[in-house]
C-alpha cells in the first residue's frame, strides 16, 4: 500500500480467482483513543472499533472511503483505491491503446518546436468518475523539472456505438535548451483514477522525436506569364523555433488532382518557394519537416489551383 | 578552417558535408515504428557518446560570441563516431555489404573532421569505450543505438554549420 495523496491510498493486488488479497491496517488520524468506530462509504454498518482497523482487501467491494467516527462526529477519512496486476502486468483498462506508432501506446505526445513545450493526449471511453494527474521530468535518476498543467477534456468523438473522449495536457520544460542535443529523455507519468480503480501510464521520449511543425503559413500562388506554371510561395509557421537559419525546415510541395486516383506530383525543397505546373481543378499543398532530423511532417497547407 | 588559433572554418563546405551526413545517417537507419530487436540495456551502451550540451556554445548566441568552443565539441564527436563506425561493432557479423551507407558515413565523418582540423593541429579527443559485443544480435542492437545517437548529433552539427554559413561567413 502507498499514499497517492493526502488520505488517498493505493492497494496493489495480484488479480486472479481466489487471490488472498492484501491485509491493510488503517489508523484514525486523531488524538482520541476510545469510542472510535469505522464505516465504509455511505453505509452506517460499523466495521470495527478502536483507533486502528485491519481489513483484508481482495476486491473492489473492499475499496472505498473508510471513515472513523466518535459520537457521531467524523474524525478522519482514508480512501482506498485498487491497482490490479494480472499475470504480472498492471491493468490498462481506463485508457485506449492508440496503437500508433506501436501497440501499447496509451499516451501520445507532440511538440511544435524545440522550446521544451509539448502536448500529450490520450483516449478513453469512460465519461464519468474519472480523474487524471500528470507529472513529468527530464531523466529519471536525477530528474530535471518539467511543469505540466491540468489535464482537460479536449475532444469528444462518436466511434460506432461508443463515445470516445480525448484528454490532453500541456507541459513545459523548466530550463529548456533548444539548441542542445538531448541526452536524457523526457518522462511523462499519468495517474488515472476511475471510481475505485487506479492505473498509471508512462511515456518516455526525446523532444526531437516528437517534433511536428505547424503547417507552412501564407501559402500563395503567382502565375508565370505565358505558362501553365505557377510560383508557389509560403513562410515558416509562427510557432517554429527561431532563428530559421539555425532551426531550418525542409518542404514537400504536392500537386493533387480532384480525384484521389490521379497521379500526385511531388517536389522537395529547402527554399520557401517552388515552381510547379497547376492543372485544372487541382490543388497545391505544402508541408514541412525539420531539415536535419526526420521527425514528423506537418499537416498540409493547401490552396486551389484556379 | 577551425584551427585552434581561432580562424574561421569553411562554413559552406561544412554545411554541405554535415547535411549529407544527416541524409546518410537516416538512410542507414530509417525511422521505423518500433525496433525489431528488444531495446534492452539502453543506458550503458550509448551514454558514453559525446553530446553537444547546453554549455558548449553551439546555440546561435554562443556561435556569434566564439564559435571555437562549439567547433571543438563537434570535432570531438566526429572523431568519436568515426572510430565507432570503424570498430568491430560495425565490421563484425552481420557484415556490411560493399555499398553500405555506413561506409559512406564513415568517410564523410572523417572528411568533415578534417575540414575542421587540418593536419598538424590537435584538439583533444575522447576515448571510445571498449564495447565488443560477442553476439550478432548484441552487435545489431548496438549499431542501431549508435546510429540513432549519431542522427541526433549530426542534426545539431548541421544546424550549427547552416547558421554559420548564413551569418558568420566572411
Amino acid at each position: 500500500i502507498w499514499e497517492l495523496k493526502k488520505d488517498v491510498y493505493v492497494v496493489e493486488l495480484d488479480w486472479y480467482p481466489d487471490a488472498p488479497g492484501e491485509m491493510v491496517v488503517l489508523t484514525c488520524d486523531t488524538p482520541e483513543e476510545d469510542g472510535i468506530t469505522w464505516t465504509l462509504d455511505q453505509s452506517s454498518e460499523v466495521l470495527g472499533s478502536g483507533k486502528t482497523l485491519t481489513i483484508q482487501v481482495k476486491e473492489f467491494g473492499d475499496a472505498g472511503q473508510y471513515t472513523c467516527h466518535k459520537g457521531g462526529e467524523v474524525l478522519s477519512h482514508s480512501l482506498l483505491l485498487l491497482h490490479k496486476k494480472e499475470d504480472g502486468i498492471w491493468s490498462t483498462d481506463i485508457l485506449k491503446d492508440q496503437k500508433e506508432p506501436k501497440n501499447k501506446t496509451f499516451l501520445r505526445c507532440e511538440a511544435k518546436n524545440y522550446s521544451g513545450r509539448f502536448t500529450c493526449w490520450w483516449l478513453t471511453t469512460i465519461s464519468t468518475d474519472l480523474t487524471f494527474s500528470v507529472k513529468s521530468s527530464r531523466g529519471s535518476s536525477d530528474p530535471q523539472g518539467v511543469t505540466c498543467g491540468a489535464a482537460t477534456l479536449s475532444a469528444e468523438r462518436v466511434r460506432g456505438d461508443n463515445k470516445e473522449y480525448e484528454y490532453s495536457v500541456e507541459c513545459q520544460e523548466d530550463s529548456a535548451c533548444p539548441a542542445a542535443e538531448e541526452s536524457l529523455p523526457i518522462e511523462v507519468m499519468v495517474d488515472a483514477v476511475h471510481k475505485l480503480k487506479y492505473e498509471n501510464y508512462t511515456s518516455s521520449f526525446f523532444i526531437r522525436d516528437i517534433i511536428k511543425p505547424d503547417p507552412p503559413k501564407n501559402l500563395q500562388l503567382k502565375p508565370l506569364k505565358n505558362s501553365r506554371q505557377v510560383e508557389v510561395s509560403w513562410e515558416y509557421p509562427d510557432t517554429w523555433s527561431t532563428p530559421h537559419s539555425y532551426f531550418s525546415l525542409t518542404f514537400c510541395v504536392q500537386v493533387q488532382g480532384k480525384s484521389k486516383r490521379e497521379k500526385k506530383d511531388r517536389v522537395f525543397t529547402d527554399k520557401t518557394s517552388a515552381t510547379v505546373i497547376c492543372r485544372k481543378n487541382a490543388s497545391i499543398s505544402v508541408r514541412a519537416q525539420d531539415r536535419y532530423y526526420s521527425s514528423s511532417w506537418s499537416e498540409w497547407a493547401s490552396v486551389p489551383c484556379s | 578552417r577551425a584551427v585552434p588559433g581561432g580562424s574561421s572554418p569553411a562554413w559552406t563546405q561544412c554545411q554541405q558535408l554535415s547535411q549529407k551526413l544527416c541524409t546518410l545517417a537516416w538512410s542507414a537507419h530509417p525511422l521505423v515504428g518500433h525496433m525489431d530487436l528488444r531495446e534492452e540495456g539502453d543506458e550503458e551502451t550509448t551514454n558514453d557518446v559525446p553530446h553537444i550540451q547546453c554549455g558548449d556554445g553551439c546555440d546561435p548566441q554562443g556561435l556569434r560570441d566564439n564559435s571555437q568552443f562549439c567547433l571543438q565539441r563537434i570535432h570531438q564527436g566526429l572523431i568519436f563516431y568515426e572510430k565507432l563506425l570503424g570498430s568491430d561493432i560495425f565490421t563484425g557479423e552481420p557484415s556490411l555489404l560493399p555499398d553500405s551507407p555506413v561506409g559512406q558515413l564513415h568517410a564523410s565523418l572523417l572528411g568533415l573532421s578534417q575540414l575542421l582540423q587540418p593536419e598538424g593541429h590537435h584538439w583533444e579527443t575522447q576515448q571510445i569505450p571498449s564495447l565488443s559485443p560477442s553476439q550478432p544480435w548484441q552487435r545489431l542492437l548496438l549499431r542501431f543505438k549508435i546510429l540513432r545517437s549519431l542522427q541526433a548529433f549530426v542534426a545539431v552539427a548541421a544546424r550549427v554549420f547552416a547558421h554559420g554559413a548564413a551569418t558568420l561567413s566572411p
Epitope: - | S27, A28, H29, P30, D36, L37, R38, E93, P94, S95, L96, L97, D99, S100, P101, V102, Q104, P136, W137, L140, R143, L147
Partner: nanobody, 121 residues
C-alpha cells in the same frame, strides 16, 4: 550480391509432410525479416509465414497449426516444415529476406528463385 536459394520442393501426398529450406549467402542476422511466400499461376503471391530478427514466426491463417517456420543461424538457413499438406498448398514457394538498411544502399528486398510443391495422391 546477396542470394537466397530454396530447395526441398517436390511431390507430396495430401496429409503428408515436406520440409523446404532457404540457404542465404550471408548471415541471416543480415535480414530484418525473412519470409516464405507462395504463388499459384494466375494469382498474386501470398504470404505464408514471416519471422523478424529475434522474434517468433507469424503465419497466414490458412497454414496456422500445420506449417512451422524455423531458422538455423549457423547454417545460414531458414526452413518451412509443411505438415498435413492440403491440395490447395500446391504452389511455387519463394523465400524472401529484407536486409537491414545499414548493410546496403540498394536492393533491401532479396528473393529466391522458388521451389515447386505439388500435392497429389
Amino acid at each position: 550480391e546477396v542470394q537466397l536459394v530454396e530447395s526441398g520442393g517436390g511431390l507430396v501426398q495430401p496429409g503428408g509432410s515436406l520440409r523446404l529450406s532457404c540457404a542465404a549467402s550471408v548471415s541471416i542476422w543480415s535480414f530484418k525479416v525473412m519470409g516464405w511466400y507462395r504463388q499459384v499461376p494466375g494469382k498474386q503471391r501470398e504470404l505464408v509465414a514471416t519471422i523478424t530478427t529475434g522474434g517468433s514466426p507469424d503465419y497466414a491463417d490458412s497454414v496456422k497449426g500445420r506449417f512451422t517456420m524455423s531458422r538455423d543461424y549457423d547454417k545460414r538457413t531458414v526452413f518451412l516444415e509443411m505438415d498435413s499438406v492440403k491440395p490447395e498448398d500446391a504452389a511455387v514457394y519463394y523465400c524472401n529476406g529484407r536486409l537491414w538498411a545499414h548493410l546496403t544502399s540498394s536492393g533491401h528486398d532479396v528473393w529466391g528463385q522458388g521451389t515447386r510443391v505439388t500435392v497429389s495422391s
